[in-house]
């Protein structure tokens, strides 16, 4: 994968692809992030790493992505969730997979749910199971707006670079 | 469906929609692909038909998107799976079916999954099931890379205009 | 916009390419619909609420969105269904949940399937079950031409604003 | 430049019909709608419905449907208007109009008007 | 379908005038809305699109301003062309209602 074996540096060199001259103006920010594989039970988001990036004014603070500028984004993020069967000794709850991208914003004292995507599973004996969440959509956002997510079943999560991802980009 | 029942270059012409201008420096490459529904067991992408199109300098060889220019494009496909029960004879063995966006380019002698979703299927008893997988998101991609698919469960794909696809566009 | 202020000859050329001509170079159509959660058995569309929004020449007409100027758009959906788990004294028979994005332009005495998805759900004892579907992708449109959609199991569709929803924008 | 020019207005009885033209020139045709928009004497604008006449898309107003049928003809560059079963209430100036955006009514013809009277 | 409710039907202002004629619409509309001048015997011309923006060639002391139900366009300082009449227009869905008109007269 992009920089694998490379130095740090060589390796951000490495994702520096060949850009169009822009104006000013036509500064198109935007962001992709990928989890981190190495925080299993925990959900970090990371632009330094694959094909991850940040550009054009989108920071990360917190775990959540800061809207450089306002305007309309389209935002969408994934996830893919596995288990194993549950043992014959132990008894088969059913597990409630969830995925959310939320808005913290100052004109709201609370987080927003922008996308929504849930699953119930109910694992079975010697039934390996695996489900994929997909959602993504444009919104009206403001300068220093927050997005972040949430997701029920972190310990589930597949974690490699193109199946748990979370992005924006400017319209 | 667009062109049905027209002869080759009216189809082509039936899809020429009225557009606007650009100046060169803002041409938009597009391209949205469609699953060849006569091939059955084999997912072969098309853009000469129904609603598929390329634009402003994407291309098709050997199956997968060239990308014209260097920049960020956004990157998408779908794929929706069936299948009917198992004869009570059989034997119902799990079906692993996943899709997933591949970038080869020439900066890695390899293809770097770009978007991958999974499912396990446990087909049941007079039981037909249907699946839909989707994903998409922004890519730093180099003139030349070449984007294409792999798919487990080719024979169980619903061959349609609307329900398997694959596309992209510059930001 | 195009060929606004340019003579016909400039205006011509101004339409080789899906964009807007850059007189009104700041112009984005882009729409972000949600169902409204008042109407519990019909998927009515909404603009006027929420994160929706319509903005630069999008519009509703018969719960379809009016495309503003032709061109490339993006063009996306989602929904959410959830249903309990079936009582034993009924029979529990298979669900068809499916949702659809069609086209409807006179030129078709038909409306014509841009986006599928599509689900089967067997309902188990004591299961309450919850099942999410996503799709967009890129079309080409013509002024005029009217998006809508339609679904198979509306009884069981989550209808908040971010589970529920339907959008687009100009390329 | 755009230009819209419309014709075949005129005394009309009531229960009979008409059949506008609005001619069109100055930009390609078939990238653009044609609305039709009336305006009683005295009174208001009312939207009739439009007609795109690159694939022959059309959509009306409610008020106006099963009796308002908006065409085109690519080859002559103009739009069409029929209405019937006229009544009083339908004396107006008739407007042909091409949008930028879908609803926004930028470009004009002068109107032509229609009395329906015996 | 939506009405649009204009206020006031007519007014008499003097050159240099500050002008506002409001429009309310009978449900939400988000910001599609637009206004057109219209002068007699004449075709309306169109002046704001999507609540607040000018369009090409219309003088900048047109302004139109509001989103929801609530609209107003503004004329900072009235010039002798600008008497006539000034229509709003929902275009949140068809079909796309007026509303009824307000006169701008010489006082």
């Known amino acids: 994968l992009p920089g694998v074996g490379l130095t740090p540096s060589a390796a951000q060199t490495a994702r520096q692809h060949p850009k169009m001259h822009l104006a000013h103006s036509t500064l198109k920010p935007a962001a992709h992030l990928i989890g981190d594989p190495s925080k299993q039970n925990s959900l970090l988001w990371r632009a330094n790493t694959d094909r991850a990036f940040l550009q054009d004014g989108f920071s990360l603070s917190n775990n959540s992505l800061l809207v450089p500028t306002s305007g309309i984004y389209f935002v969408y993020s994934q996830v893919v969730f596995s288990g194993k069967a549950y043992s014959p000794k132990a008894t088969s709850s059913p597990l409630y997979l969830a995925h959310e991208v939320q808005l913290f914003s100052s004109q709201y004292p609370f987080h927003v749910p922008l996308l929504s995507s849930q699953k119930m599973v109910y694992p079975g004996l010697q039934e390996p199971w695996l489900h994929s969440m997909y959602h993504g959509a444009a919104f009206q956002l403001t300068q220093g707006d927050q997005l972040s997510t949430h997701t029920d079943g972190i310990p589930h999560l597949v974690l490699s670079p193109s199946t748990v991802f979370f992005g924006a980009f400017a319209l | 469906l667009p062109g049905v029942g027209l002869t080759p270059s009216a189809a082509q012409t039936a899809r020429q929609h009225p557009k606007m201008h650009l100046a060169h420096s803002t041409l938009k490459p597009a391209a949205h692909l469609i699953g060849d529904p006569s091939k059955q067991n084999s997912l072969l992408w098309r853009a000469n038909t129904d609603r598929a199109f390329l634009q402003d300098g994407f291309s098709l060889s050997n199956n997968s998107l060239l990308v014209p220019t260097s920049g960020i494009y956004f990157v998408y496909s779908q794929v929706v799976f069936s299948g009917k029960a198992y004869s009570p004879k059989a034997t119902s063995s799990p079906l692993y079916l996943a899709h997933e966006v591949q970038l080869f380019s020439s900066q890695y002698p390899f293809h770097v999954p770009l978007l991958s979703s999974q499912k396990m299927v446990y087909p049941g008893l007079q039981e037909p099931w249907l699946h839909s997988m989707y994903h998409g998101a922004a890519f730093q991609l180099t003139q030349g890379d070449q984007l294409s698919t792999h798919t487990d469960g080719i024979p169980h794909l619903v061959l349609s205009p609307s329900t398997v696809f694959f596309g992209a566009f510059a930001l | 916009l195009p060929g606004v202020g340019l003579t016909p000859s400039a205006a011509q050329t101004a339409r080789q390419h899906p964009k807007m001509h850059l007189a009104h170079s700041t112009l984005k159509p882009a729409a972000h619909l949600i169902g409204d959660p008042s109407k519990q058995n019909s998927l009515l569309w909404r603009a006027n609420t929420d994160r929706a929004f319509l903005q630069d020449g999008f519009s509703l007409s018969n719960n379809s969105l009016l495309v503003p100027t032709s061109g490339i758009y993006f063009v996306y959906s989602q929904v959410v269904f959830s249903g309990k788990a079936y009582s034993p004294k009924a029979t529990s028979s298979p669900l068809y949940l499916a949702h659809e994005v069609q086209l409807f332009s006179s030129q078709y005495p038909f409306h014509v399937p841009l986006l599928s998805s599509q689900k089967m759900v067997y309902p188990g004892l004591q299961e309450p079950w919850l099942h999410s579907m996503y799709h967009g992708a890129a079309f080409q449109l013509t002024q005029g031409d009217q998006l809508s959609t339609h679904t198979d199991g509306i009884p069981h569709l989550v209808l908040s604003p971010s589970t529920v929803f339907f959008g687009a924008f100009a390329l | 430049e755009v230009q819209l020019v419309e014709s075949g207005g005129g005394l009309v009885q009531p229960g009979g019909s008409l059949r506008l033209s609005c001619a069109a020139s100055?930009?390609?045709?078939?990238?653009?709608?044609i609305h039709w928009v009336r305006q009683a004497p005295g009174k208001g604008l009312e939207w009739v419905g439009y007609?795109?006449?690159?694939?022959?898309?059309?959509n009306y107003n409610e008020k106006f449907k099963g009796r308002a049928t908006i065409s085109s003809d690519k080859s002559k560059n103009t739009a069409y208007l029929q209405m019937n079963s006229l009544r009083a209430e339908d004396t107006a100036v008739y407007y042909c109009?091409?949008?930028?955006?879908?609803?926004?009514?930028?470009?004009w013809g002068q109107g032509t008007l229609v009395t329906v009277s015996s | 379908d939506i009405q649009m409710t204009q206020s006031p039907s007519s007014l008499s202002a003097s050159v240099g005038d500050r002008v506002t004629i409001t429009c309310r619409a009978s449900?939400?509309?988000?910001?599609?809305v637009a206004w057109y001048q219209q002068k007699p015997g004449k075709a309306p011309k169109l002046q704001i699109y999507s609540a607040s923006h000018r369009y090409t060639g219309v003088p900048s002391r047109f302004s139109g301003s509001g989103s929801g139900t609530d609209f107003t366009l503004t004329i900072s300082s009235l010039q002798p062309e600008d008497f006539a009449t000034y229509y709003c227009q929902e275009v949140y869905s068809t079909p796309w209602t007026f509303g009824q008109g307000t006169k701008v007269e010489i006082k």
């Open positions: 007609n795109n006449p690159y694939n022959d898309g059309t």
């Open positions: 109009s091409r949008p930028t955006m879908l609803p926004w009514f930028a470009y």
């Open positions: 449900q939400a509309v988000s910001s599609a």
């Open positions: 100055g930009y390609t045709f078939t990238s653009y709608v």
